[in-house]
C-alpha cells in the first residue's frame, strides 16, 4: 500500500509536471503571436484512456515530437528556457511517475490533436490525479 510519504512525493512530482506543461502552454498562448499558429499544423496522438499513472507512457512517447515542434517554434520569436532541458525534466518525472517496471503499450485514440489540445489533455490528467491524492 502506498505510504503517506510516497503519496506526497507522487503529488509533488505531478505538480511539477503540471507546472512544466502549463509553462509550455502559456508560452504558446500568452505570447499572443499569431505567427505561432503554424505550430498548429503538427499532429499529436492522444491516449484512448488516461486515468492512471501508468498511462503516462502515452505522454512519454510524444515527448520527442513535442520537443521538435518547440524547437521549430523558437525561430518564430517564441522563447522557452532551453527546450531540451525542459523536455528532459518532463521525461525524468514521467519515468518516475509511471514506473519503469510497467511496460504498457500505449493505446491511442483515433482522434489526433493540435499541440494546444494535447497539452490541455495532459494538464487535465495531472489535475485529475492530483485531486484524487489530496
Amino acid at each position: 500500500a502506498p505510504t503517506s510519504s510516497s503519496t506526497k512525493k507522487t503529488q509533488l512530482q505531478l505538480e511539477h509536471l503540471l507546472l512544466d506543461l502549463q509553462m509550455i502552454l502559456n508560452g504558446i498562448n500568452n505570447y499572443k503571436n499569431p505567427k505561432l499558429t503554424r505550430m498548429l499544423t503538427f499532429k499529436f496522438y492522444m491516449p484512448k484512456k488516461a486515468t492512471e499513472l501508468r498511462h503516462l507512457q502515452c505522454l512519454e512517447e510524444e515527448l520527442k515530437p513535442l520537443e521538435e515542434v518547440l524547437n521549430l517554434a523558437q525561430s518564430k520569436s517564441f522563447h522557452l528556457r532551453d527546450t531540451k532541458d525542459l523536455i528532459s525534466n518532463i521525461n525524468v518525472i514521467v519515468l518516475e511517475l509511471k514506473g519503469s517496471e510497467t511496460t504498457l503499450m500505449c493505446e491511442y485514440a483515433d482522434e489526433t490533436a493540435t499541440i494546444v489540445e494535447f497539452l490541455n489533455r495532459w494538464i487535465t490528467f495531472c489535475q485529475s490525479i492530483i485531486s484524487t491524492l489530496t
Epitope: 499569431p34 505567427k35 499558429t37 498548429l40 499532429k43 521549430l72 493540435t114
Partner: antibody, heavy 122, light 108 residues
C-alpha cells in the same frame, strides 16, 4: 465579410517587371499569414511562399526562392508578388490565400483571392 | 523536396462514393487539408485538420487519415461535385506548404 481582392489581369513582355497585389478586408490583416499560389495553364496548384504582414516575415518555397519577391504594406492591408524580369514560363494564374486559425486549430487556406492572370509573351 | 501523391483521376457514377487518396511521408505528423476547384474558379477549402468540415460544406464530404495516407471521401456524389481536388499539407519541419498534384473527379 472576410475577403481578398486581387489586382487585374496583366499582359507583359519577357524581361519586363511586374507587381501584382492582394488586398484583405473584413479581418485583422496583420495577424494572418498570406500565401501565394501559382497555377500554370491546365496544371495543378504550386505553393510559392508566404508572408506575415505584421512584420513582413517571409518564407519562400525552394522552387521559387530568388525568382519572385513577396512583400506587404500593412498600412493599406495589401500583399504583393513581384518579378524583376518576367519569362514566358511565368504565364499563369496567381492566387493569394489566407492561412486561417482559431485558438487551438489551423484551418488551412480558408480564404482565397479571385486570382490574377499573368500572360508573358513577346 | 517533399511531395504529396494523388491519383490523376477518379471516376464515379452519381449517388456512388468517391474516394481520393493522398500520400506523403510527413502525414503521420502533419495535418492535411483538401480543396475543391471548379473550372474558372479559385480553390475552396472543403476539409481541414484531416477530417473537419468548414461551415457550408455539405456533409457528404468527409476526410480520414491513416499513417502516411489521407483520404477525401464524397458520399452520394452529385454532378456538381465534378471538379479538381487537391490535398495540401506541410513538410515534416512545418516550414513549407505543399500541394498534391490534384485529382480530377469525373461524375459519369
Amino acid at each position: 465579410e472576410v475577403q481578398l481582392v486581387q489586382s487585374g489581369a496583366e499582359v507583359k513582355k519577357p524581361g519586363e517587371s511586374l507587381k501584382i497585389s492582394c488586398k484583405g478586408s473584413g479581418y485583422s490583416f496583420t495577424s494572418y499569414w498570406i500565401g501565394w499560389v501559382r497555377q500554370m495553364p491546365g496544371k495543378g496548384l504550386e505553393w510559392m511562399g508566404i508572408i506575415y504582414p505584421g512584420d513582413s516575415d517571409t518564407t519562400y518555397s525552394p522552387s521559387f526562392q530568388g525568382q519572385v519577391t513577396i512583400s506587404a504594406d500593412k498600412s493599406i492591408n495589401t500583399a504583393y508578388l513581384q518579378w524583376s524580369s518576367l519569362k514566358a514560363s511565368d504565364t499563369a494564374m496567381y492566387y493569394c490565400a489566407r492561412e486561417g486559425f482559431g485558438e487551438s486549430i489551423h484551418y488551412g487556406l480558408d480564404v482565397w483571392g479571385q486570382g490574377t492572370t499573368v500572360t508573358v509573351s513577346s | 523536396s517533399y511531395e504529396l501523391t494523388q491519383p490523376p483521376s477518379v471516376s464515379v457514377s452519381p449517388g456512388q462514393t468517391a474516394r481520393i487518396t493522398c500520400s506523403g511521408d510527413a502525414l503521420p505528423r502533419q495535418y492535411a487539408y483538401w480543396y475543391q476547384q471548379k473550372p474558372g474558379q479559385a480553390p475552396m477549402l472543403v476539409i481541414y485538420k484531416d477530417s473537419e468540415r468548414p461551415s457550408g460544406i455539405p456533409e457528404r464530404f468527409s476526410g480520414s487519415s491513416s499513417g502516411t495516407t489521407v483520404t477525401l471521401t464524397i458520399s452520394g456524389v452529385q454532378a456538381e461535385d465534378e471538379a479538381d481536388y487537391y490535398c495540401q499539407s506541410a513538410d515534416s519541419s512545418g516550414t513549407y506548404v505543399v500541394f498534391g498534384g490534384g485529382t480530377k473527379l469525373t461524375v459519369l
